[in-house]
């Protein structure tokens, strides 16, 4: 086991594409660096013009690369992916019962919006009420990876602090990743101040995402509890009767 609860699992035989996806026959991990814990992880992707289309592709590659390093299943790590601009567009929901490879494919096809603004407050409101409105897996850690590169107008951030308080009440951890010179440092610092687990990562640009990926995964993996060991099927007693 790697430090920080990152498990190097045995490699499973690949599941053929014609077989219907069954949770107990997961796809093999693609990397040695691998997190297998109880975690509900939400990726929030800034869809503003502050990231160019090429930069947004790098951001998506980071999300997909992170997903490759997670043991995604309904019993271990569930993921949701939301692109946000002045509204929010959910591409993946926590309860989606799809193969990890299919989830990664969907994440890789998120459309670039390049809108004038991306409202952190609106996407946090969406996450608080739509994604974590009902906690259906209390035993799992709940983590939001907020990938932000822009500032919203102050009027849109009117209830920002209220949403942070809502996450604190629901024990949802926020990890802001500030990308580039236009990320809202004031909001990022406020997120950090809200709870000790809310650690921020400040990056000079999208090119740093790959360099810092393992550090970020390590941190969020450390926040989650271990998954219980799979229960073994009961042994069938073999009774041998000696000839009389």
């Amino acid at each position: 086991q790697e430090p920080g609860g990152l498990v190097v699992p045995p490699t499973d035989a690949p599941v053929s594409s014609t077989t219907p996806y069954v949770e107990d026959t997961p796809e093999p991990p693609l990397h040695n660096f691998y997190c297998s814990k109880l975690l509900d992880l939400v990726f929030l992707l800034d869809g503003s013009y502050r990231l160019s289309e090429a930069e947004f592709e790098v951001l998506k590659a980071f999300v997909v690369g992170t997903m490759e390093r997670l043991h995604i299943s309904q019993k271990r790590i569930r993921v949701a992916v939301v692109e946000y601009h002045d509204g929010s567009h959910a591409y993946l929901e926590l309860r989606a019962r799809k193969r990890p490879s299919e989830l990664r494919r969907i994440a890789s096809q998120i459309k670039y919006v390049g809108s004038q603004l991306a409202s952190t407050s609106e996407v946090l409101k969406y996450t608080l009420f739509q994604i974590f409105g009902k906690i259906d897996r209390p035993e799992a850690s709940r983590v939001i990876l907020l990938l932000t590169a822009s500032q919203e107008p102050q009027r849109m951030a009117r209830y920002f602090t209220r949403y942070l308080q809502g996450f604190k009440k629901k024990k949802v951890i926020l990890i802001p990743v500030g990308i580039g010179p236009h990320a809202n440092l004031k909001q990022i610092r406020l997120i950090e101040k809200q709870a000790p687990e809310n650690k921020a990562f400040l990056l000079s640009g999208v090119d740093e995402l790959e360099q810092r990926r393992d550090e970020i995964i390590n941190y969020l993996c450390d926040l989650a509890p271990e998954a219980p060991a799979p229960s073994k099927p009961p042994q069938v007693a073999h009774i041998t009767v000696s000839p009389g």
């Epitope: 107008p153 102050q154 009117r158 920002f160 004031k186 406020l190």
Partner: antibody
Amino acid sequence: QVQLKESGPGLVAPSQSLSITCTVSGFSLTDYGVDWVRQPPGKGLEWLGMIWGDGSTDYNSALKSRLSITKDNSKSQVFLKMNSLQTDDTARYYCVRDPADYGNYDYALDYWGQGTSVTVSS
Amino acid sequence: DIQMTQSPSSLSASLGDRVTISCSASQDINKYLNWYQQKPDGAVKLLIFYTSSLHSGVPSRFSGSGSGTDYSLTISNLEPEDIATYYCQQYEKLPWTFGGGTKLEVK
């Protein structure tokens, strides 16, 4: 210390527009919001709208179509413009400092100007 | 819009009295309530923000309480300079709205 001072025309003819200037001192308009509140004679207070430190604005939806709030940070001035005035717009108009910010959710109107009286009459 | 209703609309009390003014919201405002004092000359001051936090420079005889839809302002020991009209204001949702006011007079 924090001060806000409104200056207006006093008298406005019906259907005309109203312009009031609020000059502030003791704080920066980039760090604080400024709200506008009015009070018709013998009545209660009504919130009209506000301008944030970054220049974004919020308006009372009942008045939004005829209201505009702008500012000049360098002159420490905030401007209220209201179109198509009617007699029921007769009121004392206050500008008020608002500590609204990303980190503040207690939108208390903490320092008020003395107000300027506006009468709409022909 | 959220409606704010104050009671009583006017109140007569003696100096040294304990005075309570009530404010009711048309929906839960989650303690997002402020209290203001308006003197007869029209000057307005913030007294209390977020239901019970005293604004700087406000005497400790003023206190606020409440939750949900029901809130109150209490003046524990009425002084001559407290003669004014008092307003509550919600900031749960835009537009911010005020109560109709409570005019406090001395007997």
